[in-house]
Interface confidence: medium
C-alpha cells in the first residue's frame, strides 16, 4: 500500500502530500476514507484539498483519520493514503517520541539540521530554532535557509531541536514547529565501492500471479556522512520512470539507516497485480557513489500453488 | 566506453560565474550518474556535484551548497555545471565523470574526461 504517516499539533498547520507520484497536469482528488467524503477544495474551508496537497489550516485533534488521494491520469488511476494524526500541545516541555522527526547525525565537519517538511510549506525566514525547548543563541548557531547549522560541534550539542516558522496562505499566518533529534559523531567516515546486502546476485524471487511483489534493493556506503551514495531499479536497463508500466513503481525517497555505524540506503520496487509479462523482465538494483556502480540482478519465477490435495 | 569532453573552463574573477558543459560522444539518456569532480594543485580528486539519471536527484559537495547547480540536457547528450559566486578555493581543473548501464558489467568505474582549467583571480 502506497501509505505515509504525517502528524501536527492542533491548531497548526499541517500540510501533506499525496504519496502517489504523478505530472503536474494530473488532477488528484482527495478523500476522507471513514466517511468516503470528498474535501472540498475551496480555500475558504479550514480543511481543502490544493492539487497533490491536502491542507489542515489549522489542525484540529477530530482530523485524525486516513485521507486517500487518487492521480487521476488519461490512461490510469493511482491511490495513495495518508495517515494522518493530530495531537494536543504538551503543557510541558518534553516532546514526546510520536511526533519526532527522523534524527540526523552530525560530525564536527557535517553539523546541518534540516527542518522536518518545511519544503510543503509557503514560509519565509526567519526561522527559528529550540533546543530541548530553549531558544537557541550566540554565534555557534546560524539559522541558513531551511536548516540550522552548528559551529564547532560537540558531543553537548546533542539533543532534540525544534524548528518554528509560519505558513502564510492567502494572507493568514499559521504556525508550524516540527522536532528531530540530533546526534554527534566524533569517528572519521569513510566511503566504499557499494555493497549491496539486498538482492543476492541473480536473484530468483518467487511471486504470486495477481498478486501484489515488493523488491527491495539495500546497499552500503561507507562510514559517516556520504557526499554522493544512492540506489535504484532498472527494469531491462530502463529508468523506472521511463518503463511505462504504472504497476510497477520505486517506492518514492530512499530510507537512510545507519547499521553498525555503516550509511546504508535502501529502496523499494513495488508490483501491482503480478502478470506473466512481468516474468519476463530483468530487474536490476543499482548501487552508486563516489567510488562507481554495482548492479544485481534479480528475475522473478511464478511461485507454485501448494497442492492441498493428497 | 563514453568519451566525455568538457568546456567552459577559463579565467574569471572572485564573485563571477562560468558554466561548464560536459559533451557525451554516446547516448546519456541511459546514463546512471553523471558528475563533476574537481582537482586543486597538490590536491586530491574531489566531488563537486552529480546527477542521477533516474528522477534527476542531485548531490552537491557541501562547500558548493548554494552557489553550483548541475543539470543534463539528455537531448543533447550533455552535462553542465553552473558555478555562481566563484571564490578563489573553487581554481582546480574539473573532470566530468559518467557510470551508464552496461548489461554485461556488474561493477562499473567511471568513464572520465580530460578536464578543463577553471581559474578564480583578480
Known amino acids: 500500500k502506497f501509505s505515509k504517516q504525517s502528524w501536527g499539533l492542533e491548531n497548526e498547520a499541517l500540510i501533506v502530500r499525496c504519496p502517489r507520484q504523478g505530472k503536474p497536469s494530473y488532477t488528484v482528488d482527495w478523500y476522507y476514507s471513514q466517511t468516503n467524503k470528498s474535501i472540498p477544495t475551496q480555500e475558504r474551508n479550514r480543511v481543502f484539498a490544493s492539487g497533490q496537497l491536502l491542507k489542515f489550516l489549522p489542525a484540529a485533534v477530530a482530523d485524525s483519520g486516513i485521507y486517500t488521494c487518487i492521480v487521476r491520469s488519461p490512461t490510469f488511476n493511482r491511490t495513495g493514503y495518508a495517515n494522518v494524526t493530530i495531537y494536543k500541545k504538551q503543557s510541558d516541555c518534553n516532546v514526546p517520541d510520536y511526533l519526532m522527526y527522523s534524527t540526523v547525525s552530525g560530525s564536527e565537519k557535517n553539523s546541518k539540521i534540516y527542518c522536518p517538511t518545511i519544503d510543503l510549506y509557503n514560509w519565509t525566514a526567519p526561522l527559528e530554532w529550540f533546543k530541548n525547548c530553549q531558544a537557541l543563541q550566540g554565534s555557534r548557531y546560524r539559522a541558513h535557509k531551511s536548516f540550522l547549522v552548528i559551529d564547532n560541534v560537540m558531543t553537548e550539542d546533542a539533543g532534540d531541536y525544534t524548528c518554528k516558522f509560519i505558513h502564510n496562505e492567502n494572507g493568514a499566518n499559521y504556525s508550524v514547529t516540527a522536532t528531530r533529534s540530533f546526534t554527534v559523531k566524533d569517528e572519521q567516515g569513510f566511503s566504499l565501492f557499494p555493497v549491496i546486502g539486498a538482492p543476492a546476485q541473480n536473484e530468483i524471487k518467487e511471486v504470486e500471479i495477481g498478486k501484489n511483489a515488493n523488491l527491495t534493493c539495500s546497499a552500503c556506503f561507507g562510514k559517516g556522512t556520504q557526499f554522493l551514495a544512492a540506489v535504484l531499479w532498472q527494469l531491462n536497463g530502463t529508468k523506472i520512470t521511463d518503463f511505462g508500466e504504472p504497476r510497477i513503481q520505486q517506492e518514492e525517497g530512499q530510507n537512510q539507516s545507519f547499521s553498525n555505524g555503516l550509511a546504508c540506503l535502501d529502496m523499494v520496487l513495488r508490483i501491482a497485480d503480478v502478470k506473466e509479462e512481468d516474468l519476463l523482465l530483468q530487474y536490476d538494483c543499482l548501487a552508486l557513489n563516489l567510488h562507481g556502480l554495482r548492479r544485481h540482478t534479480v528475475r522473478l519465477s511464478r511461485k507454485n500453488p501448494i497442492d492441498h490435495h493428497s | 566506453e563514453v568519451q566525455l569532453v568538457e568546456s567552459g573552463g577559463g579565467l574569471v574573477q572572485p564573485g563571477g560565474s562560468l558554466r561548464l558543459s560536459c559533451a557525451a560522444s554516446g547516448t546519456i539518456t541511459s546514463a546512471v550518474f553523471m558528475g563533476w569532480f574537481r582537482q586543486a594543485p597538490g590536491k586530491e580528486r574531489e566531488f563537486v556535484a552529480g546527477?542521477?539519471?533516474?528522477?534527476?536527484?542531485?548531490y552537491y559537495a557541501d562547500s558548493v551548497k548554494g552557489r553550483f547547480t548541475i543539470s543534463a540536457d539528455n537531448s543533447k547528450n550533455t552535462a553542465y555545471l553552473q558555478m555562481n559566486s566563484l571564490k578563489p578555493e573553487d581554481t582546480a581543473v574539473y573532470y566530468c565523470?559518467?557510470?551508464?548501464?552496461?548489461?554485461?558489467?556488474?561493477?562499473?568505474?567511471?568513464?572520465w574526461g580530460q578536464g578543463t582549467l577553471v581559474t578564480v583571480s583578480s
Open positions: 546527477i542521477i539519471g533516474s528522477g534527476g536527484a542531485t
Open positions: 565523470a559518467a557510470s551508464r548501464y552496461a548489461r554485461e558489467r556488474d561493477v562499473h568505474a567511471y568513464d
